[in-house]
């Protein structure tokens, strides 16, 4: 059974996939940077802000060398899923207060979702272990005040910026191993 042996190349090689994932991560990093500048301009931050529900930074850039491809992609996917959930929450909970940051927040959410799809496709093509996402966390409580929401926005965008910066470095390093 079967067609004539041979079929045209229908989709990108995993190395090309990794290249386009790096490009997408870089553009998302730039989106986040611009959005952070806008947020600081409109709602100046008084120091650093934290949000307990955010993932801790996966790895220092210096420790990247020892990482394996599966652990980088699995951790990155889990962290980005968490940030996607936080951006969605932020847009729902702070719709009116942060409307000056739309449509940029919406674009960020769309691109984050696209990056997650790209990472999963890369893991499928390489046949790397795909751990199930963590069980759904309890719903995020609405911010106690407008200012509480703005502090949360600072924390989310700041954490996402650090994670994406780590991701670009990690993906570039992994490219050399593929």
């Amino acid at each position: 059974p079967g067609p004539p042996p041979g079929s045209p190349r229908a989709s990108p090689d995993p190395r090309a996939e990794l290249d386009s994932t790096v490009l997408l991560t870089r553009s998302l990093l730039e989106d986040t940077r611009q959005l952070t500048i806008q947020l600081k301009d409109k709602f100046p931050a008084d120091g650093d802000h934290n949000l307990d529900s955010l993932p801790t930074l996966a790895m220092s850039a210096g420790a990247l060398g020892a990482l394996q491809l599966p652990s980088v992609l699995t951790r990155l996917r889990a962290d980005l899923l968490s940030y996607l959930r936080h951006v969605q929450w932020l847009r729902r909970a702070m719709g009116s207060s942060l409307k000056t940051l739309e449509p940029e927040l919406g674009t960020l959410q769309t691109r984050l979702d696209r990056l997650l799809r790209r990472l999963q496709l890369l893991m499928s093509r390489l046949a790397l272990p795909q751990l199930p996402p963590d069980p759904p966390a309890p719903p995020l409580a609405p911010p106690s005040s407008t200012w509480g929401g703005i502090r949360a926005a600072h924390a989310i965008l700041g954490g996402l910026h650090l994670t994406l910066d780590w991701a670009v470095r990690g993906l570039l390093l992994l490219k050399t191993r593929l």
């Epitope: 041979g6 079929s7 190349r9 229908a10 989709s11 090689d13 995993p14 190395r15 599966p70 899923l81 799809r117 999963q120 496709l121 499928s124 093509r125 390489l126 046949a127 790397l128 272990p129 795909q130 751990l131 199930p132 996402p133 593929l178």
Partner: antibody, heavy 114, light 111 residues
Framework: EVQLLESGGGLVQPGGSLRLSCAAS????????MHWVRQAPGKGLEWVAV????????YYADSVKGRFTISRDNSKNTLYLQMNSLRAEDTAVYYC???????WGQGTLVTVSS | QSVLTQPPSASGTPGQRVTISCSGS?????????VHWYQQLPGTAPKLLIY???ERPSGVPDRFSGSKSGTSASLAISGLRSEDEADYYC???????????FGGGTKLTVL
């Protein structure tokens, strides 16, 4: 042009063994995870086993666990499936497939019968 | 019995739009794993038709489209043609099996 060419199929008695091979060309074999998927006559597709791009991860369907072994030789652009303790229900066309799977071979028929 | 559930058959007349469903569970489609669709023409090997829920490989006509919601996915074929008569399979990664799972297949007949 991507090519995946399976070989090694044939008629074997229950309890016997076979080794399938899949020769790949036209793409960077060492960058792709590789699968074996089978199709019993007149039935649907059943995933059998997968091996990661570098051979460090291997997963098997419950129906073949402990009997089949997937392996690859990236220097030869070849995928293998060692099948032991074969049963009548293993009778199928065995396809080698790359990636998602994105690409499929033409299949090789394995018949287990006395 | 397949882990992903598809209707065994579907049919339509030339030019019509036909939809094929694929139902999964929380360990596969519902776990945010992507769904892929394959077309198997009579006597041939399967061919990737849709990947990552709604992406088309180069060479696949835009008459074919995919979507996903919750624990289900669907394949839509518009402007049905006689050459679309084939078996269609959905597939997704399953975390409980640590591997991909296929639907049982849907035989599409063009009347």
């Amino acid at each position: 042009e991507v090519q995946l060419l399976e070989s090694g199929g044939g008629l074997v008695q229950p309890g016997g063994s076979l080794r399938l091979s899949c020769a790949a060309s036209g793409f960077t074999f060492s960058s792709y995870g590789m699968h074996w998927v089978r199709q019993a006559p007149g039935k649907g597709l059943e995933w059998v086993a997968v091996i990661s791009y570098d051979g460090s991860y291997k997963y098997y369907a419950d129906s073949v666990k402990g009997r089949f072994t997937i392996s690859r030789d990236n220097s030869k652009n070849t995928l293998y499936l060692q099948m032991n303790s074969l049963r009548a229900e293993d009778t199928a066309v065995y396809y080698c497939a790359a990636g998602v799977p994105d690409y499929w071979g033409q299949g090789t028929l394995v018949t287990v019968s006395s | 019995q397949s882990v992903l559930t598809q209707p065994p058959s579907a049919s339509g007349t030339p030019g019509q739009r036909v939809t094929i469903s694929c139902s999964g569970s929380s360990s596969n489609i519902g776990s945010d794993y992507d769904v892929h669709w394959y077309q198997q023409l009579p006597g041939t090997a399967p061919k990737l038709l849709i990947y990552s829920n709604n992406e088309r490989p180069s060479g696949v006509p835009d008459r074919f489209s995919g979507s996903k919601s919750g624990t289900s996915a669907s394949l839509a074929i518009s402007g049905l043609r006689s050459e679309d008569e084939a078996d269609y399979y959905c597939a997704a990664w399953d975390s409980s099996l640590s591997g991909p799972v296929f639907g049982g297949g849907t035989k599409l007949t063009v009347l």
